[in-house]
Interface confidence: medium
């Protein structure tokens, strides 16, 4: 007799481990024989899906191959034209070992910052995550938290969270473990020790003091007077994070010194600085005609005319005094190559000391002119026949603005070393020296001996620079 | 006739060193400064260091200082370039050239053949 | 630091005017950087031109003379021939203590 379909062994839920086997069994007494059909969240699955395999005349569904979306509600429903169509649902849970999805990554953080390491998971029962600092579990407190997502949250990162993280996912099929990462805290500049002020005397040593910290350690720049540093010795030592730079300076001028601290973060540069103020006892700003200060020479062409450790004057007209002097002399140097021998050791000393004038430097920085016999016998023993020939071409403008080349000096404008012998400067290297006899024989009295000369230059200025080039 | 010859140049390791040379001849080699001029194989010229006349000062690009040492003997009217630490970048032909005074600087009137120095592996 | 710059290559025909450029990637050249101008045939060591902008070395031809052009050096060679094809350099002083002679990088001239 016909018999309505009847199930007898209802689905069940299936737990599966991913990869592994699941089989629903949905058991029907009736005649005829029914018609069963399978149907995974409502859509029917087909009889010719590989992933399936439907026997036992359609009793019995098997996933060959557990993935983690065949999670759903699997109903069988069978029919054979005697009553009503049955239905029986059951439940897959596709359960999963831990895995970590995203892990954290390395993590460059400037202290005072909010750090997320990231560390996304997936299984199934949902695993719990938890983190590792170091060898230690990390403890949550006020400024860490494991998010709900499992990334690790670090308000108002400080140095000691610094360090190696991990994650770690664990449900009751097994454990997770992401790869170490790092947590490195940059800390932004910052001066522990500023220079101190000083108020010395002219000529005197100060050493400026700065110390300065911060991740990476800090570079220490000096800057004086808006420029950097261009004299003077600086000794750095770095030890536990902290940088020390000390700068040794002979003071020869007041002035602002600043130090500059300065590490990077990224593309980004922190900075912190400090200034201290030398200033001179009973310094006075120079005299108008006297712009400038004396310093000790530190050039490379005049060091073996002038004396040793000289204290020469250098001109602020010009924006670096030094490189401008030094560059005139150079120039006007290579143009003594070609006068005479006799002539060109008189000039050399004539040139450098008119360029370098010794300085003397009292309140008021002054520079002392040579004094005129001295430039005399250059023009009218040493180098005459030179001396009249540059004049000449000077008169005549032969001499290009770039070739800046001095042009002849006017010894009767120099002061006399008979009216003040301290008022203009001697060239000691032009003095005939009986018991060390130089190349130049002695002179009569009328002129002092003369032996190896520079160039003058006084306030009044005998020597001028072609006044078209700018050393600036 | 004025002469710079170079010598010293040669195939060394990454962070290796060697000592380059200059022989000069021709002129007063202790009233001119002198520089090494380094040439990549295919690039352009880049200043490397130089020294005044006395040698009483030094100067160096950025990249090679606190490596390399330049100096002077002027009584053998020798230059010498010693490059420690050296990196491949350094591989170039490197020239000695004679300054046109005293000063550190000033154009190099005068230029030796080069010697090839090839930092590699 | 600044990057010296100049045309990376420039043609001129036998007998032309042709002028080369050299400038700072900030700022303008002055009569403070000494502008100096090196020739380099292929397989050769370089050669000094011009010096402090226009100052010419003994036995360099007339043809070749240095100047400025707006805020740049300029060397021109006035009636080009075969034997000027080569690499050009100009070279920048930088001073202020540094002391440094910076190069550009070179300007491939052919005499077609």
């Known amino acids: 007799l016909p018999k309505a379909p009847v199930i007898t062994t209802p689905l069940e839920t299936v737990d599966a481990l991913v990869e592994e086997v699941a089989t629903f069994m949905c058991a029907v007494e009736s005649y005829p024989q029914p018609e069963i059909s399978w149907t995974r969240n409502k859509i029917l699955i087909k009889l010719f899906d590989t992933r399936y395999s439907i026997r036992e005349n359609g009793q019995l569904l098997t996933i060959l191959s557990v993935e983690d979306s065949d999670d759903g509600i699997y109903c069988c429903t069978a029919n054979n034209g005697v009553g009503g169509a049955v239905e029986s649902c059951g439940a897959l849970q596709v359960k999963m070992k831990p895995k970590i999805t995203r892990p954290p990554i390395n993590v460059k953080i400037i202290e005072g910052l909010k750090a997320v390491l990231p560390c996304t998971t997936m299984g199934n029962p949902k695993p719990s995550v938890s983190w590792i600092k170091g060898d230690s579990p990390l403890r949550e407190n006020s400024r860490t938290a494991v998010l709900e997502s499992g990334s690790l949250r670090i308000h108002n990162v400080q140095k000691e969270d610094a360090g190696q993280y991990r994650c770690v996912a664990k449900n009751s099929l097994g454990t997770a473990y992401s790869k170490v990462v790092k947590l490195e805290v940059e800390v932004f500049a910052r001066i522990l020790r500023a220079p101190e002020s000083h108020n010395v005397t002219f000529g005197s040593f100060v050493t400026l003091h700065c110390t300065a910290t911060g991740i990476p350690v800090p570079t220490i720049t000096w800057i004086e007077n808006g420029n950097a540093v261009s004299s003077g010795s600086i000794q750095e030592s770095v030890k536990d994070r902290v940088i020390d730079s000390r700068l040794q300076l002979f003071i020869t001028k007041p002035g602002l010194y600043t130090c500059i601290a300065t590490n990077k973060h990224g593309e980004k540069f922190s900075t912190a600085k400090a200034a201290a103020t030398v200033s001179i006892a009973e310094w006075s700003k120079p005299q108008k005609d006297n712009k400038g200060y004396c310093a000790q020479y530190r050039g490379e062409v005049c060091n073996a005319v002038l004396a040793k450790d000289a204290l020469v004057f250098l001109n602020t007209s010009y924006a670096d005094p030094e490189e401008a002097q030094e560059l005139l002399v150079h120039t006007a140097w290579n143009e003594l190559k070609v006068v005479s021998p006799l002539c060109r050791p008189a000039a050399e000393a004539l040139l450098c000391n008119h360029v370098f004038q010794e300085c003397s430097p009292g309140v008021v920085p002054t520079p002392i002119p040579i004094c005129r016999e001295y430039c005399l016998a250059v023009k009218e023993l040493f180098c005459a026949k030179e001396w009249l020939a540059m004049e000449e071409k000077t008169h005549r403008g032969l001499y290009r603005s770039e070739m800046h080349l001095l042009s002849v000096p006017e010894c009767s404008k120099l002061p006399s070393m008979h009216w003040d012998p301290t008022a203009c400067a001697r060239l000691p290297h032009l003095d005939y020296n009986k018991e060390n006899p130089k190349t130049f024989p002695p002179m009569t009295s009328s002129k002092p001996s003369v032996d190896i000369p520079n160039l003058p230059s006084s306030s009044s200025s005998s020597f001028s620079v072609s006044p078209t080039y700018s050393m600036t | 006739e004025l002469q710079l010859v170079e010598s010293g140049g040669g195939l060394v390791q990454p962070g290796g060193s060697l000592r380059l040379s200059c022989a000069a001849s021709?002129?007063?080699?202790?009233?001119?400064?002198m520089s090494w001029v380094r040439q990549a194989p295919g690039k352009g010229l880049e200043w490397v260091s130089a020294i005044p006349w006395n040698g009483g000062s030094t100067y160096y690009k950025e990249s090679v200082k606190g490596r390399f040492t330049i100096s002077r003997d002027n009584a053998k009217k020798t230059l010498y370039l010693q490059m420690n630490s050296l990196k491949s970048e350094d591989t170039a032909v490197y020239y000695c050239?004679?300054?046109?005074?005293?000063?550190?600087?000033?154009?190099?009137?005068?230029w030796g053949q080069g010697t090839l120095v090839t930092v590699s592996s | 630091q600044a990057v010296v710059t100049q045309e990376p290559s420039l043609s001129v025909s036998p007998g032309g005017t042709v002028t080369l450029t050299c400038g700072l990637s900030?700022?303008?050249?002055?009569?403070?950087?000494?502008p100096d101008w090196y020739q380099q045939t292929p397989g050769q060591a370089p050669r000094a031109l011009i010096y402090?902008?226009?100052s010419r070395l003994s036995g360099v031809p007339s043809r070749f003379s240095g100047s400025f052009s707006g805020n740049k050096a300029a060397l021109t060679i006035t009636g080009a021939q075969p034997e000027d094809e080569a690499d050009y350099y100009c070279?920048?002083?930088?001073?202020?203590?540094?002391?440094?002679?910076?190069f550009g990088g070179g300007t491939k001239l052919t005499v077609l």
């Open positions: 070279a920048l002083y930088m001073g202020s203590g540094s002391r440094n002679y910076v």
């Open positions: 900030s700022g303008s050249v002055t009569s403070s950087n000494y």
């Open positions: 050239a004679k300054r046109s005074g005293r000063i550190a600087f000033g154009a190099l009137d005068a």
């Open positions: 402090s902008t226009n």
């Open positions: 021709g002129f007063t080699f202790d009233d001119y400064g």
